[in-house]
């Protein structure tokens, strides 16, 4: 029960005092008390409950006619059953006793008022009265948690604008209010209450450039909303009139959770004593609801695609057509961003991360716009963002970026339990370097930050500084399967690669050809692959990075060895000793449900089927998955990416609430 | 054969900032790493800044490092060097420099730590 | 003071052949077959003419020619060419935290 007022009594004349519903209120008894009296006794009028503990220990027992010893570890507290119809219409009469004199009464006028700040703290939808039931002013995570929930209203109701909802400190329309969280304040007092005292919604300094509070004034045509609290106003004095009176105010987010804010956000409503003009307001009561910001939360290859993006560039036409055609399998829709608006960018994986936020009543779903800006840098704002579908983004718009701050490097597990702790969500995973130097390339700070902040996928750091791109999609994905954890992770393996070739050879393949069938490009026989001393010490190095990532991969994502399949896969060194493909890197797939475009690695033909190929299908095929090898090799393989570079999906959200768990 | 015209280059004060470019014409510089090397006025060539062919990674000198950015714009087929915090001793004539970063090889050449196209240079002074 | 060390000036008459060296460490000449020699005639840019080691770029005659013993490459010009008077400068990938580094320059006179 929330805590009142103290009131003190007194003999000498009667005391009023304002008493809310659902609050213990405290009665000084003694200080007041004449100097002879050593006991009391105290009667109350019907809608008034009076406790008296004498400790310790603390015997408790309601009014009755019995008298009690007048010290001060006798605690008497107070608590109204109604709402007053009239001021001080609830009495409350202290009796003192003493040896010699007679008793000496003090009178108490209490006005039971009815004040309740409501959200939807058991976040089920609805907002629902909840004095005295629970405290409000505590978040909890977990199934039996509670708490408000708000989403940044980070969607684009309004097509002609180019700003953001949550931007404006207008409410666009209905569905522009769907955004937002509905905190109802609910207030039951008699009809002149309000002339001597006021309520102030409030919210922390620190606090208020994180929120806005639209105020509903319910019209008689329509409802229209004004602001009432955010990034310039702290407080707001609010007009309520007496009697029985519901207020309807509706609160937006403005920042995602981040280093510098935890997600939580105190909303309060004080109620202020105005009576004497000549003195300060006095506070009597307050009542606060805590929110936290919705995080945003990405989605695995495992969750089911919706819509498919591309790009449209130079001579890719067949490219498209064979995303087209997975897309269609998978019952996907698919967006395709133009030449004249992706400027020759066509690294659509990279320029952005389509996640989503959730709140009990509306799922939304937002692109995470990476630094990167080349060519696609318009694309999220333009295209992607709009109604119900939010935009964020992070890190510095002007340089300081690098290769690693590109979403490419930036991708999330199924969920996972690890050592007996749960991921219902997943974990992120991104590249880094393994030590920093002079050189070595990292993940932007402020966009690490931010996915920490989100607290619902704890991340987990990779080494991708080995690669010439440095992306975590170069080495490793997943894919969903029927049994076991519910999926199976990637990775490139030149191990198995060699290990093929070797049988091959074996077999008297030798002299089969890498790259047939590529006009221009110098073909390499297996004979001489497996040869080449200097490849074979480029691909000892990348296995030993590989390695290392798998060794993390099954600390941290809490996998066994039959939870990872190894694709055959070879690099080799560039400049500076990174690394790229040797051919098309087949684990740079686009996963869309059973469907995988996989980039055609125009491996050696034997027995006329590519056997690269056929030994990525005998190993996924198993787990009900189809393979369509697409030729990406002149569009995307040679400008150093692949088939999930070139792409990006947005996916279903998953069916557990975040709030559900305990990160 | 890619051509490389500098440009950008003058006269500017002690802890000024100068943005250089390197224009490409007769051929697409995005199949091309790219360095900035410096010749103080009658002195020897230094190494300044590189950039690989997919804009995914740089490196630069200890004389420059935190001072001086290296970018590429591949769609306007132009390579930058934004020098900030300039110093006396960065004077020097500007030449930018490339080498085709050919898929075929089987392995590295080492392309990247040779300069096969070098442009004409852009003289950079800096004096109060 | 340049990391890989070359003699400041070499000279030769028409016909001869003359050396330049360039030493440099383990952690550079000696480690990685990445050397390259540069060609520059005064008020001009410098011209490749020798890579990884001892590669050739097209255009350049055969009498230049390069060679690498531990941590020590050097550069022969057979049959001297007046056109040859040049500065002559080499360079190399390294471990060190500046990743390419070059010689001083030699002044090649031709008699």
């Known amino acids: 029960m929330a805590q009142g007022t103290l009131i003190r009594v007194t003999p000498e004349q009667p005391t009023h005092a304002v008493c809310v519903l659902g609050t213990l209120t405290q009665l000084d008894i003694c200080s007041s008390a004449p100097e002879d009296c050593t006991s009391f006794s105290i009667n109350a009028s019907p809608g008034v409950v009076v406790d008296i503990a004498h400790g310790p220990p603390a015997k408790k027992k309601s009014t009755g006619s019995s008298t009690w010893p007048l010290d001060p570890g006798v605690e008497v507290t107070l608590t109204m059953k109604v709402a007053s119809g009239s001021t001080g219409d609830q009495k409350v009469q202290i009796s003192y006793y003493g040896p010699k004199t007679p008793p000496v009464k003090a009178l108490l006028y209490l006005t039971g008022v009815e004040i309740s700040l409501c959200a939807d703290i058991t976040r089920t939808g609805k907002v629902k009265p909840t004095r005295a039931v629970k405290d409000q002013r505590t978040w909890t995570w977990g199934p039996c948690g509670q708490g408000a929930i708000l989403l940044v209203n980070c969607d684009r109701d309004n097509l002609e604008s180019s700003a953001m909802d949550c931007e404006d400190d207008e409410v666009l329309d209905s569905e522009d209010l769907q955004d937002m969280s509905l905190m109802t304040l609910s207030t039951k007092t008699p009809k002149d209450f309000f002339t001597n005292h006021t309520l102030v919604l409030h919210v922390a300094r620190s606090e208020m450039d994180k929120v806005r509070v639209f105020q509903a004034t319910r019209g008689k045509l329509s409802s229209k909303c004004s602001v009432v609290l955010g990034p310039k106003w702290p407080s707001h004095y609010l007009m309520v009139p007496g009697g029985k009176h519901n207020m309807d105010f509706y609160v937006e987010a403005l920042a995602f959770p981040d280093t510098d804010f935890p997600g939580l956000i105190t909303l309060t409503i004080s109620l202020l004593d105005t009576s004497n003009l000549e003195l300060p307001e006095a506070v009597v009561f307050q009542d606060s609801v805590v929110f936290r910001v919705a995080p945003w939360i990405m989605t695995p290859n495992t969750q089911p695609p919706q819509e498919v993006y591309a790009c449209s560039i130079f001579e890719n036409e067949d490219f498209l057509k064979s995303v087209t055609t997975l897309a269609m399998k998978a019952k996907c829709k698919l967006t395709i961003c133009p030449e004249e608006e992706n400027m020759d960018d066509q690294w659509m994986q990279d320029e952005m991360e389509i996640g989503y936020i959730q709140a009990p009543h509306k799922t939304l779903p937002v692109v995470f716009d990476s630094p990167r800006n080349r060519g696609l840098k318009e694309f999220p704002i333009k295209r992607v963002m709009g109604p119900d579908f939010g935009y964020v983004t992070r890190g510095p718009q002007t340089g300081g970026i690098s290769g690693l701050d590109s979403f490419g490097n930036l991708e999330v597990s199924p969920p996972v339990t690890v050592r007996g702790k749960e991921y219902p969500l997943g974990r992120i995973l991104f590249g880094d370097s393994c030590y920093p130097s002079n050189d070595s390339r990292q993940m932007h700070q402020a966009l690490q930050d931010f996915l920490s902040a989100q607290q619902v996928q704890a991340p987990v750091k990779l080494y991708s500084d080995w690669l010439s791109v440095g992306h975590v999609d170069e080495f490793l994905s997943f894919v969903p399967a029927p049994d076991r954890k519910g999926f199976r992770l990637l990775l490139a393996s030149p191990r198995s690669c060699y290990k093929l070739f070797q049988e091959q050879q074996n077999e008297g393949h030798g002299e089969a050809l890498l790259f047939e069938g590529i006009k221009k490009k110098k073909q390499q026989k297996i004979k001489n692959i497996l040869s080449n001393k200097t490849l074979r010490e480029h691909n000892s190095f990348v296995e030993r990075c590989i390695d290392w990532n798998r060794e993390l991969l099954k600390r941290e994502l809490g996998l066994a060895e039959s939870d990872i399949i190894d694709i055959p896969q070879l690099f080799k060194l560039k400049e500076f000793s990174k690394a790229e493909a040797f051919f098309p890197n087949m684990v740079n797939m686009l996963v869309l449900g059973k469907h995988l475009g996989i980039p055609k690695p125009f491996g050696p033909v034997i027995n006329g089927r590519c056997c690269l190929e056929e030994k990525v299908c005998s190993l996924l095929e198993p787990l009900g998955l189809q393979c369509t090898f697409i030729n990406d090799f002149f569009t995307y393989h040679i400008r150093h990416g692949e088939v999930h570079c070139g792409t990006n999906v947005r996916r279903k959200p998953f069916s557990f609430k975040w709030w559900n768990m305990v990160p | 054969q890619v051509q490389l015209v500098e440009s950008g280059g003058g006269l500017v004060k002690p802890g000024g900032s100068l943005r250089l470019s390197c224009a490409a014409s007769?051929?697409?510089?995005?199949?091309?790493?790219v360095s900035w090397i410096r010749q103080a006025p009658g002195k020897g060539l230094e190494w300044v800044s590189f950039i690989n062919s997919a804009n995914t990674f740089t490196y630069y000198a200890d004389s420059v490092r935190g001072r001086f950015t290296i970018s590429r714009d591949n769609a306007k087929n132009t390579v930058y060097l934004q020098m900030n915090s300039l110093r006396a001793e960065d004077t020097a004539v500007y030449y930018c420099?490339?080498?085709?970063?050919?898929?075929?090889?089987?392995?590295?050449?080492?392309?990247?730590?040779?300069?096969?196209?070098w442009g004409r240079g852009t003289l950079v002074t800096v004096s109060s | 003071q340049s990391a890989l060390t070359q003699p400041r000036s070499v000279s030769g008459s028409p016909g001869q052949s003359v050396t330049i060296s360039c030493t440099g460490t383990?952690?550079?000449?000696?480690?990685?077959?990445?050397v390259s020699w540069y060609q520059q005639h005064p008020g001009k840019a410098p011209k490749l003419i020798i890579y990884n080691v001892y590669e050739r770029p097209s255009g350049v005659p055969d009498r230049f020619s390069g060679s690498k013993s531990g941590n020590t490459a050097s550069l022969t010009i057979s049959g001297l060419q007046a056109e040859d008077e040049a500065d002559y400068y080499c360079s190399s990938h390294s471990r060190s935290s500046t990743p390419v580094l070059f010689g001083g320059g030699t002044k090649l006179t031709v008699l």
């Open positions: 420099s490339s080498a085709n970063d050919d898929v075929d090889d089987i392995v590295a050449p080492g392309r990247g730590y040779y300069m096969d196209v």
């Open positions: 383990r952690g550079d000449v000696g480690r990685y077959n990445h």
């Open positions: 007769g051929s697409t510089l995005s199949d091309y790493f």
